[in-house]
């Protein structure tokens, strides 16, 4: 008689099998070592019960385990992203186990029929690594279940199965449609493992979310805020990817995640840092770029362990390829308004100069409006490293270059129709940068000139390490 | 050393059906994904689809799909082309090729191919 | 679908010089570095063989004398010295991710 799995009965009788495949007697998941760099070779299929294709093959029960989990399929082949990340574990981790679930027939089916082979899949998988546990040396510690998407959700209940904790599960953009608000035994949670880390690159608040977009485990990290990731706009992809339609933009995005852990294995001298923070509006107001109590992290395999009480939710901005990482400033700016200006939307831009080289000029993102009179804080970030700042160049954008621009001046001159001379006053910067931490303070270079006002620009140069100026209280640093 | 042995040539008439195989040696069958591709006389390449010799599910282009079906007979290490309702156009040359179900997805070893004639 | 467009569709080429086979794809078939492009020979009354693969890289047992290049959407197979024995149809192919995957329409190349 069948043996029941698992919680909740009999996980056989879930299969949704497409009927070619019905009479198979043939298990529905196999398991490929990948024993070579060279993405082409076969590798070797491991068997439940059978030791000798784990000597053959060279299983080392000491050392760490991969199990690289793929998604939903529409072609029923393994798409392009697997053999860059099998061969980026291997450079890595030299003697490591890179084991492939194949779960190609359950998984190349209608979406809701593969979502409904999930749990039979993962169940697959907790089976074989409790056949694993029974052998000299092997630790469910040293196991790294990695899912991509729907695959996220299939380690989930691997970890959930299995006897005992897996060490951790690395979620990369797990699947959202069925998901989304689902009980945490049916999909990717926090208790699946030891330590389970997201990557979200396709979260969208309006229409269909490809990826989940709640926090699933114990940090949870929105590159881009999780949603639009940079080079995968419609531009982008037609010219520099096999990519050229808006499902194309979509693939790009949720597969993002994938790059991003390939990167964070293969730059490991380039680690990208990622801010908790409580969403992704105070984010890129600059308001999260603290590492005081665990609050930054590496993102992907560098990502230290942390398991809080409650989920992790963390940001960070990216380039749009490999090595993905940039470098986040803090900018907080006092701004001074002698007159009553009514509502001013400036368009500033920065360009900041270092020891190293100098970045772009670069927009200051106004997430909601400028506060005169008071404190505001914007989030820049550079694609180089710029070494130590020096000085700061601040330019009020004069002419409108955009639609957007020409309203935005229109609006203010209706507003204040008498007030030609729109002027603000910037009599110093504080920057603090995410990767070093360290925090610096620029004053204006002519200390009689602070006026800035549209077209012009204003310079501002090192004037302290830290942020404290003389006969200044100590400013309240926002947290997340 | 790895073959792709494929049956002989077929003459037959427009509305009969043929069933072409390909007997792989020289490696283990099922994994390795096979593919098949069509050439007409004087043309040049056609790729037709895929079978996935491990789960038995076939994968066609659009313009094979109706009357063309792929098959397996894993224990002969075979795979078969069946097409129904022959037309005057299926006349061509059809090659079964292997490729890894890792990696870039070429095709590194094909059959000899099988004529196939449709006349009435 | 991605179109791959071989140039020029037939070419002579004397014994010992060089030939050059254009495939110009609709679309990219670049992938994070790598390019899915392969290259096959194929001689009358036989099956197509591999000559490169991903664009540059020579299958096993295959002379030096072919090299491919390229990327993006943009590639060439050289054949340089040209022997009697290379006389055939040159077939380019691409096989990034989601099929369907296509061949260039051949290139037949004769040795003069």
């Known amino acids: 008689s069948p043996t029941p799995f698992g919680p909740e009965g009999q996980l056989e009788d879930e299969l949704h099998k497409p009927k070619a495949i019905q009479t198979e007697v043939k298990p529905s998941v196999r398991f490929n070592l990948r024993t070579s760099k060279d993405p082409e070779h076969e590798g070797c299929y491991l068997s439940l019960g059978h030791s000798q294709p784990l000597e053959d093959c060279g299983f080392n029960m000491t050392a760490k385990t991969f199990f690289i989990i793929h998604g939903w399929t529409m072609s029923g082949i393994f798409e392009n992203w697997l053999h860059k990340l099998v061969s980026a574990l291997h450079t890595r981790e030299k003697d490591a186990n890179v084991v492939v679930v194949d779960w190609l027939p359950l998984a190349h089916q209608l979406y809701t029929d593969a979502v409904n082979n999930t749990r039979v899949v993962g169940h697959s998988i907790a089976r074989m690594l409790d056949w694993l546990q029974e052998k000299d040396d092997f630790s469910l510690e040293n196991v790294h279940l990695i899912g991509y998407s729907l695959g996220a959700h299939v380690a989930g209940y691997a970890g959930n199965f299995v006897k005992g904790t897996v060490g951790r599960i690395t979620g990369l953009d797990p699947a959202g449609p069925m998901f989304e608000g689902a009980d945490i035994h049916k999909r990717l949670s926090p208790d699946d493992a030891d330590f389970v880390d997201v990557l979200h690159t396709y979260t969208r608040s309006f229409g269909l979310s490809i990826g989940i977009q709640m926090p699933v485990g114990h940090i949870d990290i929105y590159p881009n805020g999780g949603d639009f990731q940079p080079g995968c706009g419609l531009n982008d992809v037609l010219g520099s990817m096999a990519y050229g339609t808006i499902t194309e933009v979509v693939k790009c995005e949720h597969e993002r995640a994938v790059h991003l852990f390939v990167d964070s294995l293969v730059n490991q001298d380039k680690p990208s840092f990622a801010f908790q923070c409580t969403d992704s509006n105070r984010f890129k107001k600059g308001i999260c770029l603290s590492c005081r109590k665990n609050r930054c992290n590496s993102i992907g395999y560098n990502a230290k362990k942390m398991r809080n009480k409650r989920n992790s939710k963390m940001y960070l901005k990216t380039r749009a390829g490999m090595p993905f990482r940039v470098y986040h400033y803090q900018m907080k700016i006092h701004v001074f308004s002698y007159k009553n200006m009514g509502e001013i939307e400036p368009t500033f831009y920065v360009t900041l100069y270092g020891t190293n080289a100098d970045s772009q000029t670069l927009p200051l993102e106004i997430v909601e409006r400028i506060e005169q009179n008071a404190t505001n804080t914007f989030l820049v970030y550079t694609e180089e490293d710029l070494g130590d700042l020096l000085k700061i160049q601040l330019t009020w954008e004069g002419a409108s270059q955009s639609w957007y621009n020409l309203w935005k001046e229109l609006r203010s001159y209706l507003s204040q129709p008498h007030n030609p001379g729109r002027e603000l006053n910037i009599r110093r910067i504080r920057v603090k940068s995410g990767e070093t931490q360290r925090k610096l303070t620029f004053c204006a270079e002519d200390p009689e000139n602070t006026s800035i006002s549209p077209g012009r620009e204003l310079w501002f140069r090192k004037c302290r390490d830290g942020w404290r100026m003389k006969n200044e209280t100590s400013p309240t640093v926002e947290l997340p | 050393q790895i073959q792709l042995v494929q049956s002989g040539p077929e003459l037959k008439k427009p509305g009969e059906t043929v069933k072409i195989s390909c007997k792989a040696s020289?490696?283990?069958?099922?994994?390795?994904?096979m593919n098949w591709v069509k050439q007409a006389p004087g043309k040049g390449l056609k790729w037709m689809g895929w079978?996935?010799?491990?789960?038995?599910?076939?994968t066609y282009t659009d313009d094979f799909k109706g009357r063309f079906a792929f098959s397996l007979e894993t224990s002969a290490s075979t795979a078969f082309l069946q097409i129904n309702n022959l037309k005057n156009e299926d006349t061509a040359t059809y090659f079964c090729?292997?490729?890894?179900?890792?990696?870039?997805?070429?095709?590194?070893?094909w059959g000899q191919g099988t004529t196939l004639t449709v006349s009435s | 679908d991605i179109v791959l467009t071989q140039s020029p569709a037939s070419l002579a080429v004397s014994l010992g010089q060089r030939a050059t086979i254009s495939c110009k794809a609709s679309?990219?078939?670049?992938?994070?570095?790598?390019?899915?492009m392969h290259w096959y020979q194929q001689k009358p009354g036989q099956p197509p063989k591999l000559l490169i693969y991903?664009?540059?890289n020579l299958e096993s047992g295959i002379p030096a004398r072919f090299s491919g290049s390229g990327s993006g959407t943009d590639f060439t197979l050289n054949i340089h010295p040209v022997e009697e024995e290379d006389a055939a149809t040159y077939y380019c192919?691409?096989?990034?991710?989601?099929?369907?995957?296509?061949f260039g329409g051949g290139t037949k190349l004769e040795i003069k």
């Open positions: 991903a664009a540059s």
């Open positions: 020289g490696y283990t069958f099922t994994n390795y994904g």
């Open positions: 679309q990219s078939v670049d992938y994070d570095g790598d390019s899915y």
């Open positions: 090729a292997r490729f890894s179900y890792y990696g870039r997805h070429y095709f590194d070893y």
């Open positions: 192919q691409q096989t990034n991710d989601d099929p369907p995957w296509t």
């Open positions: 079978i996935n010799t491990y789960s038995g599910v076939p």
